[in-house]
């Protein structure tokens, strides 16, 4: 009786068990009792990454300026072209097909982690003692000045957009504060 | 150093069952196909079964089929032969061995192999 | 099934002798031949893969020809720890068989 399985580098076909073809290469023809698989090196801007019996080779993915994208790995005969993206801007999902513009941290709030190529901005608000008062992509909530490191008293508190407003000692307040 | 240790062997009555185990270290044991082996008394070798490295594929000699099993533990980097309704025929040493595929990338020569044999564990069936 | 046939069953020869094993197939397997030696006691040693490649480590004097049903294994020039049984085994398809070995024994 016909064989019914293969080993792992082989596949079944007209009885026999035939040679896949290697990563970078497609089949041409399959193999017969007398003769081995024929394979052939895909082309230009092809590729193959898996042993294999596919009869065309597939196109290296186009990393598409216009869609904000860039070649971060030139791909090979065996791998992919791995897209990323410009400059200030991160990939929508894992294959990266799009890219959008990282956000930005609204006042309030500041940058807690960086975008990446392929992650967006990640912001916390501000805490107490903390704020932020720009928009921004790169910007951490800064602390409060510390009025009283410049022997200065606060005359407005801070909040978690704005910062405290230092201003001089009431000197008669101080004077009799201290008598 | 790379090593296949076989056990379990013994002295069973035909009708009876007996599970092989076959050790394997030195290597990634869970990236390579295996098979078993086995060698009657003065007798040549004969191929009885083999596994894929997932353990999803298996096949079997016609002289072994529906009485033997085998799997794998690719987490304890074991090889099992499960043997049951053994009869006399069966007597022999059982070798585990790994299957290696032997690539050369220029494309010439793209081949399977046996590497890596155990010593052999001896099964009896006799009454 | 695939029958592998191999010739003669023993030899008979002496240290420094040139000696040919051949293996035939049933049917067509290529280049997928495997030659194993074994000595008594002990299990198979891969010896050649693919026909006629040889395995890492063993010596040059052993050699493997062959496509299609017709292979051989040559020894140019026999040394004592060659004296052992010597089998074919096809990895073309499954079952996967051996030839019933052949005896070298020394003069």
């Known amino acids: 009786e016909p064989p019914t399985a293969c080993r792992e580098k082989q596949y079944l076909i007209n009885s026999q068990c035939c040679s896949l073809c290697q990563p970078g290469q497609k089949l041409v023809s399959d193999c017969t009792e007398f003769t081995e698989t024929e394979c052939l090196p895909c082309g230009e801007s092809e590729f193959l990454d898996t042993w294999n019996r596919e009869t065309h080779c597939h196109q290296h993915k186009y990393c598409d300026p216009n869609l904000g994208l860039r070649v971060q790995q030139k791909g090979t005969s065996e791998t992919d072209t791995i897209c990323t993206c410009e400059e200030g801007w991160h990939c929508t999902s894992e294959a990266c097909e799009s890219c959008v513009l990282h956000r930005s941290c609204s006042p309030g709030f500041g940058v807690k982690q960086i975008a990446t190529g392929v992650s967006d901005t990640i912001c916390e608000p501000c805490p107490v003692g903390f704020f932020s008062n720009v928009s921004s992509a790169f910007e951490k909530c800064h602390p409060w000045t510390s009025c009283e490191t410049k022997d200065l008293v606060v005359q407005q508190a801070g909040t978690n957009k704005t910062d405290v407003v230092c201003g001089p000692q009431d000197r008669l307040r101080h004077h009799h504060h201290h008598h | 150093e790379v090593q296949l240790l076989e056990s379990g062997g013994g002295l069973v009555r035909p009708g009876g069952s007996l599970r092989l185990s076959c050790a394997a270290s030195g290597f990634t044991f869970g990236s390579y196909e295996m098979n078993w082996v086995r060698q009657a008394p003065g007798k040549g070798l004969e191929w009885v079964s083999y596994?894929?490295?997932?353990?999803?594929?298996?096949d079997y000699a016609d002289s072994v089929k529906g009485r033997f099993t085998v799997s794998r533990d690719n987490s304890k980097n074991l090889l099992y032969l499960q043997m049951n309704s053994l009869r006399a025929e069966d007597t022999a040493v059982y070798y585990c061995?790994?299957?290696?595929?032997?690539?050369?990338?220029?494309?010439?020569?793209?081949?399977?192999?046996?590497?890596?044999w155990g010593q052999g564990t001896m099964v009896t069936v006799s009454s | 099934d695939i029958q592998l046939t191999q010739s003669p069953s023993s030899l008979t020869a002496s240290v420094g002798d040139r000696v040919t094993i051949t293996c035939r197939s049933s049917q067509g397997i290529r280049s997928s031949l495997a030659w194993y030696q074994q000595k008594p006691g002990k299990p198979p040693k891969l010896l050649i893969y693919g026909a006629s490649s040889l395995e890492g480590g063993v010596p040059s004097r052993f050699s493997g020809s062959g496509s299609g049903t017709d292979f051989t294994l040559t020894i140019s020039s026999l040394q004592p720890e060659d004296f052992a049984t010597y089998y074919c085994q096809q990895l073309n398809s499954f079952p996967s068989t051996f030839g019933q070995g052949t005896k070298l024994e020394i003069k």
């Open positions: 061995a790994r299957d290696v595929f032997f690539f050369d990338s220029s494309g010439d020569n793209h081949a399977y192999g046996m590497d890596v």
């Open positions: 596994i894929s490295s997932s353990g999803e594929t298996t």
